[in-house]
Interface confidence: low
Amino acid sequence: MQKGDQNPQIAAHVISEASSKTTSVLQWAEKGYYTMSNNLVTLENGKQLTVKRQGLYYIYAQVTFCSNREASSQAPFIASLCLKSPGRFERILLRAANTHSSAKPCGQQSIHLGGVFELQPGASVFVNVTDPSQVSHGTGFTSFGLLKL
Amino acid sequence: MQKGDQNPQIAAHVISEASSKTTSVLQWAEKGYYTMSNNLVTLENGKQLTVKRQGLYYIYAQVTFCSNREASSQAPFIASLCLKSPGRFERILLRAANTHSSAKPCGQQSIHLGGVFELQPGASVFVNVTDPSQVSHGTGFTSFGLLKL
Amino acid sequence: MQKGDQNPQIAAHVISEASSKTTSVLQWAEKGYYTMSNNLVTLENGKQLTVKRQGLYYIYAQVTFCSNREASSQAPFIASLCLKSPGRFERILLRAANTHSSAKPCGQQSIHLGGVFELQPGASVFVNVTDPSQVSHGTGFTSFGLLKL
């Protein structure tokens, strides 16, 4: 892609951050070995990646979590990659589901999501999970990013 | 990307290779339907992908393994994507963890890792696992690659 | 990539479609939040993505399925990303395997596949699974796509 000023590279990779908030939206930070190519993509409120230019983007997220079947709800652990475009409804782009482990105290599992989507200027993407308290925040376990084609 | 000579495509995809070595670093080969775009990325010592040009790269790995909870250690199976840059410490870029299966003799699981990272000239990336003897080397199950944005 | 007319962006993202066919090849549709950049990539017969231009492509698939160990065969659930090029071998590019869950009535699991491959003009890629009746077709759970480097 190695583009000129007219067409700069746009890419981001942010790192999960434990949060005391009870929201299902995961929190992220520009810490560790993160990527933020320029101001054409930004991390807003620690929760969403927002792009300034329209175009096709490969968007991905990885979530590692630790859960136990007996201690969790019947429903599986679900991670969702969601889109909010200005003046539009929020929508789910991608989801992955993993049934809780029978391992005790909890069993770790990792989910990876990724796909190519058209984003409008000002569009934001974020990651939702069924239970953020189960997410693993150790180095490299949970991350979120995008790259503009 | 379809770039000119000044800015060639740089991409690699290599295939897992069973190894008698006891190291936790996975071994790879240019075999089967592999990709090696040019000499700006190379597979060194069968274990690491090394790049000659600085820039943003999407790096990924997939590891399929077969393990059993009773026959394995308490700790989960962990796959790590690691970076070694000239004159710098090694660091973990991405990790995924899966608790061992209760299936017998072993239960298969697949892990996928991927993210966008800035690499320096001469930087190498490699994949570590907790138990290489559990990795599946059948066609397509375990692979490793990158592409330059 | 933001390319000129000589070198347009080529990308696709299609959404899983439940099928009454007994074939192991998954069916896809241009529905929901899909991507089809132009006619240089097409979805043929609802089952394969076919490209018109030679080059390196990042190809990916995500499959979510729900299965139970007692109700399924001994063999794990396997998803395969396959390639058919004119006058060449049909071949497996990537595979992932997950042992069936012990959860009842079934346990959900998600598989992600992705890698960089050289495609010839007229080459088609498709996704095979061991049991298509176990695949989850809820919003965002199962998808398939590619992007040209």
């Epitope: - | 080969a29 075999k31 089967g32 339907y33 592999y34 080397h137 059948g138 066609t139 397509g140 | 060449r88 071998f89 071949r91 497996i92 050289e118």
Partner: nanobody
Framework: EVQLVESGGGLVQPGGSLRLSCAAS????????MGWFRQAPGKEREFVAA???????SYADSVKGRFTISADNSKNTAYLQMNSLKPEDTAVYYC????????WGQGTLVTVSS
């Protein structure tokens, strides 16, 4: 130099069987995928079967259940067992070795006729 030499072709009656062999030399056999193609008179060469370096097989729909491909790494040889042969299987059968490049044998003629 890569060399592929086919053998085992011949005349067989419908419903009969043949086993083709492809002896390979000049490359690391276990690092390559081996396959068979065929070309009937007046037609284009078409894929028949392939076996990957990991032992995974694939077949053209027209031969599934009748033909079996295999490879013996110790002998650097690939095989195509052809059962329940039909007149439409008549063709020159070519062995192929493929990694990033493609190498062909010279072909062996299979004629299915009563």
């Amino acid at each position: 130099e890569v060399q592929l030499v086919e053998s085992g072709g011949g005349l067989v009656q419908p419903g009969g069987s043949l086993r083709l062999s492809c002896a390979a030399s000049g490359f690391t056999f276990s690092r390559y995928e081996m396959g068979w193609f065929r070309q009937a008179p007046g037609k284009e060469r078409e894929f028949v079967a392939a076996v990957t370096e990991g032992g995974t097989t694939s077949y053209a729909d027209s031969v599934k259940g009748r033909f079996t491909i295999s490879a013996d790494n110790s002998k650097n040889t690939a095989y195509l067992q052809m059962n329940s042969l039909k007149p439409e299987d008549t063709a020159v059968y070519y062995c192929a070795a493929e990694s990033l490049g493609r190498w062909w044998g010279q072909g062996t003629l299979v004629t299915v006729s009563s």
